[in-house]
Interface confidence: low
């Protein structure tokens, strides 16, 4: 009888009640798998899931969420509400990102901005809910006599050139030379 | 309980904006979403969208290009404005809250009776 | 967009009646099929989601069916307070779309 079972291909079952060995699965059920002595019952996709694929007799049905709500888990076990940019989702429900977080994301936790400092870089953008600080050069890149050697490009907002990059550098520039002669004039007052 | 309060005008001149504000109480519009439907004699039940919890927005894509519905989770208000109305957008507008366990509406305001008239 | 046709505008019953009001779907919508009630002067309430899950607090004499394209709500002993309009709702996608009711009188 085992090796008569091993015949039954996908979508039927090894009935040993019948004399027709294998019996096609009954209706809202499937097996996906050959010489199985059960149909398993097709998942049903209510409330918050709706059917992304249809169960057929060889395979299970395919949940998704309905709109407003997102998928968690293997195989879309869960359905979790959707929250907008800048917010995350707690037991009360959507909340904004405190100050220092962000989630650029309908899903999912407020993470902390980047820390530009360690990486020995400065903020060029500053960071909001919904969107990550910009780190740009590092202050020594900045400097006069600086290396010439290019440092990679940030990741940038749109609308942030580079041409901004280089006012900051020249600024940066003509303020260390406006304080250079501020202390030389300091001095020379104090000789006199 | 739970209760959906409108409040907005009657009569609206074609061409011109409807605006109607949706007071909820009882339920909290960071936990449930907000639909807005409209019923009138020749069209029957129209669903025009619906704001989530989250603030996210759908729309009914016959009505995207002229609708809003924006909300003020701190004053428990959802604000439905439709621009360039005309005489066929006569209807009852409806707001309605959307439960946790479907797109469906299980409670619903009073309704607001629009007249596009000159 | 989906159409839901209630073919039915209205339907006679008596007090203790079983009564059957058909919703079909212009295509596929699975289980995702809502059924309300509107009372005269009342404001419209879910009975029915997901074609046959109660929504609480639902009298267990209502009861949703179907799947894909035909979909039934049943009452079963009708009520005298049950006398009302039905509309079938579909939230497989948008739009979301109605039925055009189905109106409960008495014989």
């Known amino acids: 009888l085992q090796d008569l079972c091993s015949n039954c291909p996908a979508g039927t079952f090894c009935d040993n009640n019948r004399s027709q060995i294998c019996s096609p699965c009954p209706p809202n059920s499937f097996s996906s798998a050959g010489g199985q002595r059960t149909c398993d019952i097709c998942r049903q996709c209510k409330g918050v899931f709706k059917t992304r694929k249809e169960c057929s007799s060889t395979s299970n049905a395919e949940c998704d969420c309905i709109s407003g709500y997102h998928c968690l888990g293997a195989e879309c076990s869960m359905c979790e509400q959707d929250c907008k940019q800048g917010q995350e989702l707690t037991k009360k429900g959507c909340k904004d990102c405190c100050f220092g977080t962000f989630n650029d994301q309908k899903r999912g936790i407020c993470r902390p901005w980047t820390n530009c400092s360690l990486d020995g870089k400065s903020v060029l953008v500053n960071g909001t809910k919904e969107r990550d600080v910009v780190c740009g050069p590092s202050p020594a890149d900045l400097s006069p006599g600086a290396s010439s050697a290019t440092p990679p490009a940030p990741a940038r907002e749109p609308g942030h050139s580079p041409q901004i990059i280089f006012f900051l550098a020249l600024t940066s520039t003509v303020v260390l030379f406006l304080l250079f002669f501020l202390v030389l004039d300091y001095k020379d007052d104090d000789d006199k | 309980q739970v209760q959906l309060k409108q409040s907005g005008p009657g009569l609206v001149q074609p061409s011109q904006s409807l605006s109607i504000t949706c007071t909820v109480s009882?339920?909290?519009?960071?936990?449930?979403?907000v639909h807005w439907v409209r019923q009138s004699p020749g069209k029957g039940l129209e669903w025009l969208g619906v704001?989530?919890?989250?603030?996210?927005?759908d729309y009914n894509a016959a009505f995207i290009s002229r609708l809003s519905i924006s909300k003020d989770n701190s004053k428990s208000q959802v604000f439905f404005k439709m621009n360039s109305l005309q005489a066929d957008d006569t209807a009852i507008y409806y707001c309605?809250?959307?439960?946790?366990?479907?797109?469906?509406?299980?409670?619903w305001g009073q309704g607001t009776s629009v007249t596009v008239s000159s | 967009d989906i159409v839901m046709t209630q073919s039915q505008k209205f339907m006679s019953t008596s007090v203790g009646d079983r009564v059957s009001v058909t919703c079909k779907a212009s295509q596929n919508v699975g289980t995702n099929v809502a059924w309300y009630q509107q009372k005269p002067g009342q404001s419209r309430t879910v009975l029915i989601y997901s074609a046959s899950y109660r929504h609480s607090g639902v009298p267990d004499r209502f009861t949703g069916s179907g799947s894909g394209t035909d979909f039934t709500l049943t009452i079963s002993n009708v009520q005298s307070e049950d006398l009302a309009e039905y509309f079938c709702?579909?939230?497989?996608?948008?739009?979301?779309?109605f039925g055009t009711g189905t109106k409960l009188e008495l014989k």
């Open positions: 704001i989530w919890s989250g603030g996210s927005t």
């Open positions: 709702q579909q939230y497989n996608s948008y739009p979301l779309t």
């Open positions: 309605a809250r959307n439960p946790l366990t479907a797109t469906v509406m299980d409670y």
């Open positions: 009882g339920f909290s519009l960071t936990s449930y979403g």
